[in-house]
């Protein structure tokens, strides 16, 4: 009786279990009732990082100077290149596609430690008492405003993101 | 395209003064915050001065407080930058950058050589 499922590394084609390419190695051909799987190795600045039944290896990353990028680890057959921005430039994303000059931090954030040439901007949240409804790479969290010393009262309470609202107070007639 | 063309930069000797300009063009400038950083030959970068959207809030470096003034004409869509008292190690290639700066949008900037 045919498998229905197939062991791991293996893929089930035409009612048989076929072994798949080892990583670095993409396929030819499938296996048949006479023949193995049979894979070839990938081409040079091409990679296959998992075990596979792909008939077409992947491009390594391009690290693009134009961008900022540089290489900080060449890719082999079994992983990609991985990018990395120039000195005192920082990448945008986990994955390093682009680069700035410093990340700014979001509303509801304010900027903990200013940029240097190594670090990037370092964000904190606005605790309790205070907000910012910008995005920044050098402004800190701004407390609320205090309507009391105004003489006024609180009419809209503030947010991580937004300033108090004041308003008059309720005079008795 | 963003383009920001740096202006203004010179020899100077120590203890004078000099005024940088910053010519934005490719976005809408009144609506981003500001910067000024520089590059001391062999160095590394360093910003220098920030200043938000509205020309209300700044930032300076310990290392320029009180010698430099950083201001903006959103109508005129130029940054500048006030530099006095200026000393040697303030020598440097300053560039204006906007937030978020990307790679590619970096220009060449201006040349501040300050020597006898």
């Known amino acids: 009786e045919p498998p229905t499922a197939c062991r791991e590394k293996q893929y089930l084609i035409n009612s048989q279990c076929c072994s798949l390419c080892q990583p670095g190695q993409k396929l030819v051909s499938d296996c048949t009732e006479f023949t193995e799987t049979e894979c070839l190795p990938c081409g040079e600045s091409e990679f296959l990082d998992t075990w596979n039944r792909e008939t077409h290896c992947h491009q390594h990353k391009y690290c693009d100077p134009n961008l900022g990028l540089r290489v900080q680890q060449k890719g082999t057959s079994e992983t990609d290149t991985i990018c990395t921005c120039e000195e005192g430039w920082h990448c945008t994303s986990e994955a390093c596609e682009s680069c700035v000059l410093h990340r700014s931090c979001s509303p509801g954030f304010g900027v903990k430690q200013i940029a240097t040439g190594v670090s990037d901007t370092i964000c904190e949240p606005c605790p309790v008492g205070f907000f910012s409804n910008v995005s920044s790479a050098f402004e800190k969290c701004h407390p609320w405003t205090s309507c009391e010393t105004k003489d006024l009262v609180v009419q809209q309470a503030g947010t991580n993101k937004t300033d108090v609202v004041c308003g008059p107070q309720d005079r008795l007639r | 395209e963003v383009q920001l063309l740096e202006s203004g930069g010179g020899l100077v000797q120590p203890g004078g003064s000099l005024r940088l300009s910053c010519a934005a063009s490719?976005?809408?400038?009144?609506?981003?915050e500001m910067w000024w950083v520089r590059q001391a030959p062999g160095k590394g970068l360093e910003r220098v001065s920030?200043?938000?959207?509205?020309?209300?809030?700044?930032y300076y470096a310990d290392s320029v407080k009180g010698r430099f003034t950083i201001s903006r004409d959103n109508s005129k869509n130029t940054l500048y930058l006030q530099m006095n008292s200026l000393r040697a190690e303030d020598t440097a290639v300053y560039h204006c950058?906007?937030?978020?700066?990307?790679?590619?949008?970096w220009g060449q900037g201006t040349l501040v050589t300050v020597s006898n």
């Open positions: 920030a200043i938000n959207p509205q020309g209300t809030r700044t």
């Open positions: 950058a906007k937030l978020p700066m990307f790679f590619e949008d």
């Open positions: 490719g976005f809408t400038f009144r609506d981003y």
